[in-house]
């Protein structure tokens, strides 16, 4: 038992209990007495007074510890004062005496971590644990330590923070609400295709956590980091009382990397099916996963199944753009979508990438749009699109770029949300190219932009300036 | 200061048994402390064969238990050793003694010779 | 039960030597060791207990140590009220018991 913990405790006599049906006593002695010199006697008020068996453990340059179990569970009752006192036998003294309630001096043993892996969000840990005394959970509360397992800095920083068990899973909640229309109406959210915020270092972790009765989710981390992690627990304070528990034994986990790092893009065209594409990493293979999951809070069982992707033919349509590995899959309206690829290099080293939960709704990639244009005066354009999906025309934003002939550099414009076409003004006697492209945008639905339409090649006529 | 004396017949009968009594004067043996009989044979062997706390429990040498008794009178500040059916092995010089603060005894009699022969 | 076995039954030292005595249980009796020194005709006299702790009165020439299953008595210059037969007794666990004594005598 790791004693060290009671510490703080000033009483001589020491005592704790470790499920609140037993309790063990110990005090230390630096005389050298004899064995059988002491008796630890208990009783409760008006009882007659009973010795508790005590054995004894030499302890280097100190002296004896004595310690008692108490042999009978019936002899640990909560709520009533315990009257304890050591005696001498061979000599009349009463070495140390004190007054406790059984319920007051909880010690928890360690609960035993039993599964450790990656949540359902890069840079999540959803850990579950068994308590060893499972009757006494709801009276406890947990603290969980973890930090970066780092082979070259053993002393990589350290979080510790409680866990609170009145949170629900983060991780169920909606995924990525469409707050970004407050911005500018073609707003990147942070989807699942696109870089999120950037993560901070361990050291300035703030990072969330809940729990639900054995289990609790820690968000925040590194995605493709190894953490070590330990819990403790302590009585609440409120039904029981005592100390902090030991930590239990420390476990590692490698989290799953971000599929941000793959170019990880999910779409669906019909709201029924799914493709998912990453760019092909060299010398290496690599398999898409995904399964749906249910937005109920805290569910017991929070450990997936994952599915194949089922593969597709891989794409490498020029020189210039990295070589796509495609997947894709049914999907559901109801559900959330998660996905996984594993990327297995040349050694056979498996390595795991998570992409951020998503709904179908907001992975809906519009057909590429049609652009046509009429020049009004020189320089002067009139431009007009059709909306590929007129069911969403309000939640449609464009973005217009356009070059000129020999120049490398775009220009982009974005046209009001909704708008069906605008006037663009350009030199006179110039070449042009144009291309457009939509995206959904809005309360109901969102998703990747549309491939941009084919280039719109324009020459402007002599004379008005722009 | 504390003293101990022992009494008791100088030649014992075999199969009879031996009376010893050990005086104390100086503190009351009710008080504290842990009272002892320590025997030494004619060869100089020690040997511890039991004690009386000042609360008046007990305890003895497995090898003598059978046939030892150690018993006080709080009146008269004594305690008493009783060895039933002695034999010539019993021969010895009879001590008794007081387990001190450290455990160790620290306060002896001067002891009382004890021949056990027909 | 634990026996106490002290190697040498007798010394012949002459006075100023140091002399040490020692003494072997059978078992660890973690330092519940006294030493004791009888003179013929008189009943033992303690000098120390807890394996190193000096009796008051005792002169500081007697030392003890040791741990586990082996202790030491010391007399660092031997005077000549120190022949007697020294013993050694646990009192870790009932019985308790003692060495069977070594004898100083002078040469």
């Known amino acids: 038992q790791d004693v060290s913990l009671l510490a703080s405790d000033s009483e001589p006599l020491k005592c704790f209990s470790r499920t609140f049906e037993d309790l063990t006593c110990f005090w230390d002695e630096e005389e050298a007495a004899p064995s059988g010199t002491y008796q630890l006697l208990y009783a409760y008020p008006r009882e007659k007074p009973r010795a508790c068996p005590l054995s004894s453990q030499s302890m280097p340059h100190f002296g004896t510890r004595y310690v008692c179990q108490f042999p009978d569970q019936e002899e640990v009752r909560l709520f009533f004062p315990l009257h304890l006192w050591v005696k001498n036998v061979f000599l009349n003294q009463t070495r140390t005496q004190r007054v406790l309630f059984v319920d007051s001096v909880g010690l928890p043993a360690p609960p035993s971590i039993i599964k450790a892996m990656g949540g359902s969000q890069p840079g999540e840990l959803q850990i579950s644990w068994e308590e060893p005394a499972p009757e006494i959970s709801d009276f406890l509360r947990y603290e969980l330590r973890y930090g970066p397992r780092d082979p070259k800095n053993s002393t990589g920083p350290t979080v510790i923070q409680l866990i609170a068990t009145e949170t629900c899973c983060p991780a169920l909640q909606r995924p990525h609400s469409a707050s970004a229309l407050d911005q500018s109406p073609c707003a990147q959210p942070t989807m699942p295709w696109q870089d999120g915020p950037k993560q901070t270092s361990p050291s300035r972790e703030a990072s969330a956590l809940t729990a639900e009765g054995g289990s609790c989710l820690i968000s925040g981390l590194q995605p493709g980091n190894s953490y070590w992690l330990q819990l403790r627990s302590e009585p609440d304070g409120i039904s029981l009382g005592g100390s902090w528990g030991s930590w239990s034994l420390p476990v590692t986990v490698d989290l799953p990397g971000d599929a941000v790092a793959l170019g990880l893009q999910c779409f669906t065209l019909d709201l029924k099916n799914v493709t998912c594409q990453w760019q092909q990493q060299d010398h290496a293979s690599s398999q898409g996963f995904f399964y749906h999951s249910r937005a109920r809070c805290c569910p017991r069982d929070r450990y997936p199944i994952w599915e194949n992707c089922e593969e597709e033919e891989k794409t490498n349509p020029g020189l210039q753009t990295p070589q796509f590995s495609r997947c894709h899959f049914k999907s559901r309206n109801d559900s959330i979508i998660h996905i996984l690829v594993e990327v297995t290099t040349a050694p056979g080293t498996v390595h795991s990438y998570l992409g951020s939960p998503f709904w179908i709704h907001q992975a809906v990639r519009l057909p590429t749009p049609n652009l046509h244009w009429r020049e009004i005066s020189s320089g002067h354009l009139e431009l007009e699109w059709q909306h590929p999906s007129s069911w969403a025309a309000q939640e449609t934003c464009y973005q217009l770029r356009y070059t000129g002939e020999g120049h490398q550099d775009w220009k982009v414009l974005e046209p009001p949300l909704g708008a069906r076409g605008g006037t663009l003004e350009l030199r006179p006697r110039s070449r042009y190219r144009l291309q457009l492209r939509a995206r959904l945008n809005g309360p109901t639905y969102q998703g990747p932009w549309s491939s941009w339409s084919d280039p719109t090649r324009v020459e402007t006529a002599t004379e008005t300036a722009w | 200061d504390v003293q101990l004396q022992e009494s008791g017949p100088g030649l014992v009968k075999p199969s009879q048994s031996l009376s010893l009594t050990c005086t104390v004067t100086?503190?009351?043996?009710?008080?504290?402390?842990?009272w002892n009989w320590i025997r030494q044979f004619p060869g100089n062997k020690l040997e511890w064969m039991g004690y009386?706390?000042?609360?008046?429990?007990?305890d003895y040498n497995p090898s003598l238990k059978s046939r030892s008794s150690i018993t006080r009178d709080t009146s008269m500040n004594q305690f008493f050793l009783q060895l039933n059916s002695v034999t010539t092995e019993d021969t010895a010089t009879y001590y008794c003694?007081?387990?001190?603060?450290?455990?160790?005894?620290?306060?002896w009699g001067q002891g009382t010779s004890v021949t056990v022969s027909s | 039960d634990i026996q106490m076995t002290q190697s040498s039954s007798s010394f012949s030292v002459s006075l100023g030597d140091r002399v040490t005595i020692t003494c072997k249980a059978s078992?660890?009796?973690?330092?519940?060791l006294a030493w004791y020194q009888q003179k013929p005709g008189n009943a033992p006299r303690l000098l120390i207990s807890?394996?190193?702790s000096l009796e008051t009165g005792i002169p500081s020439r007697f030392s003890g140590s040791g741990s586990g299953e082996d202790y030491t008595l010391t007399i660092t210059s031997l005077q000549t009220e120190d022949v007697a037969t020294y013993y050694c007794?646990?009192?870790?666990?009932?019985?308790?018991?003692f060495g069977g004594g070594t004898k100083l005598e002078i040469k």
């Open positions: 003694a007081r387990l001190g603060r450290r455990y160790a005894l620290d306060y």
């Open positions: 009386i706390t000042y609360s008046g429990s007990t």
């Open positions: 007794q646990q009192y870790w666990t009932t019985p308790w018991t």
């Open positions: 100086g503190y009351s043996i009710t008080i504290d402390y842990t």
């Open positions: 078992e660890d009796i973690y330092i519940r």
């Open positions: 807890a394996a190193t």
